[in-house]
């Protein structure tokens, strides 16, 4: 992996091997399909997604970066399991990036058309924040080989 030079990071590799990122893939695929199916939905309007309820940002702990509450009753099973898996990477931003890249690579063949791929990438980029976790400062989700800092 060019961007993060992870070859030497054995701890990250073992974390990635242990992690089950399938619930994240399922959650994201369901989400983009649900967004596509929403009749008349403006794709740029604030999310009306029942799994991501908007909350008052003033109510939350300033050190919890997301208004998404993992314990919320409205959370989907896939999202909750996904967030639990991603939680393992929270204090290693290089490893969090690698996990996101792995999700992208696993799903890239299943995405139909540029629009679906772009929407998947958008949701994936923001997945850590949706889970109330820190996002990596930089993370390239392009699946083609080569090329740094292409977003």
């Amino acid at each position: 992996r060019q961007q993060w030079e992870l070859q030497g990071d054995r701890r990250c590799q073992s974390q990635l091997e242990r992690a089950n990122l399938r619930p994240c893939e399922q959650h994201l695929m369901q989400k983009i399909q649900r967004d596509e199916d929403s009749y008349g939905r403006d794709p740029y309007s604030p999310s009306q997604d029942p799994y991501s309820p908007s909350q008052d940002p003033d109510r939350r702990d300033p050190y919890s970066p997301s208004p998404y509450d993992r314990r919320g009753a409205g959370s989907s099973q896939h999202q909750e399991r996904c967030c639990n898996e991603l939680n393992e990477f929270e204090n290693n931003q290089r490893c969090m990036c690698e996990a996101l890249q792995q999700i992208m690579e696993n799903q890239s063949d299943r995405l139909q058309g540029r629009q679906q791929e772009q929407q998947f990438k958008r949701e994936l980029r923001n997945l850590p924040q949706q889970c109330g976790l820190r996002a990596p400062q930089r993370c390239d989700l392009e699946v083609e080989s080569g090329g740094r800092d292409r977003y």
């Epitope: 999310s47 300033p62 970066p65 290693n92 923001n126 996002a135």
Partner: antibody, heavy 116, light 108 residues
């Protein structure tokens, strides 16, 4: 190539209003959270506001809560900061910046001066 | 809130000198730290992110190190274009960011 261009700054009297704009290009704007940051010679850099990629939520520094509103138009790749009830201490250079995971890209800034 | 304390606030150096600037966080921020360079009248330009990762296109004389609460920016051999202000930024509490007060590198 990521480009951010702020506009809308100017001189305004205390209690007045301004709306800053930030035109974005060279990246997938609708897929990233966005920030406003300001800079003064005495206080240095201060984070001001953040908006989620899909505008579902916003965050503000305490000193501007209730006075400033961050918003975005993803169809036009534009970020906004509506500033009301402006005070002399809001005088600063205002920058827009991209959020994670594309941190580090800032615009050139637009100057806001609040003075009677 | 996390405070970022940067030192020194200014320093005088000559071309070819090794320059070290430090940034301390009031609590553990892991490696969620960036270093920026700013020249008068210009926007801040990122040099380093994730404490030690060099931004693409930035000369290799710039390097960053540290984790937790103590971080360092080193310029191994100062060049004429490096006379500028430098500041650190933490994004551990993202989307809230906090910044160091800055270090001005001047000609000796």
């Amino acid at each position: 190539q990521v480009q951010l261009m702020e506009s809308g700054g100017g001189v305004v009297q205390p209690g007045g209003s301004l709306r800053l704009s930030c035109a974005a290009s060279g990246f997938d704007f609708p897929g990233y959270g966005m920030h406003w940051v300001r800079q003064t010679p005495d206080k240095g850099l201060e984070w001001v506001a953040y908006i989620w990629y899909d505008a579902r939520s916003e965050d503000y520094v305490d000193s501007v809560k209730g006075r400033f509103t961050i918003s975005r138009d993803n169809s036009n790749n534009t970020l906004y900061l509506k500033m009301t009830d402006l005070r002399p201490q809001d005088t600063a250079m205002y920058y827009c910046a991209v959020g994670a995971p594309l941190e580090g890209y800032w615009g050139q800034g637009t100057r806001v001066t609040v003075s009677s | 809130d996390i405070q970022m304390t940067q030192s020194p606030s200014s320093l005088s150096a000559s071309v070819g000198d090794k320059v070290t600037i430090t940034c301390r966080a009031s609590q553990n921020i892991a490696d969620y730290l960036s270093w920026f360079q700013q020249k008068p009248g210009k926007a801040p330009k990122i040099l380093i992110y994730a404490a030690s990762t060099l931004q693409s296109g930035v000369p290799s004389r710039f390097s960053g190190s540290g984790s937790g609460t103590h971080f360092t920016l080193t310029i191994s051999s100062l060049q004429p274009e490096d006379f500028a202000s430098y500041f650190c930024q933490q994004s551990y509490t993202s989307p809230t960011w906090t910044f160091g007060q800055g270090t001005k590198v001047e000609v000796k």
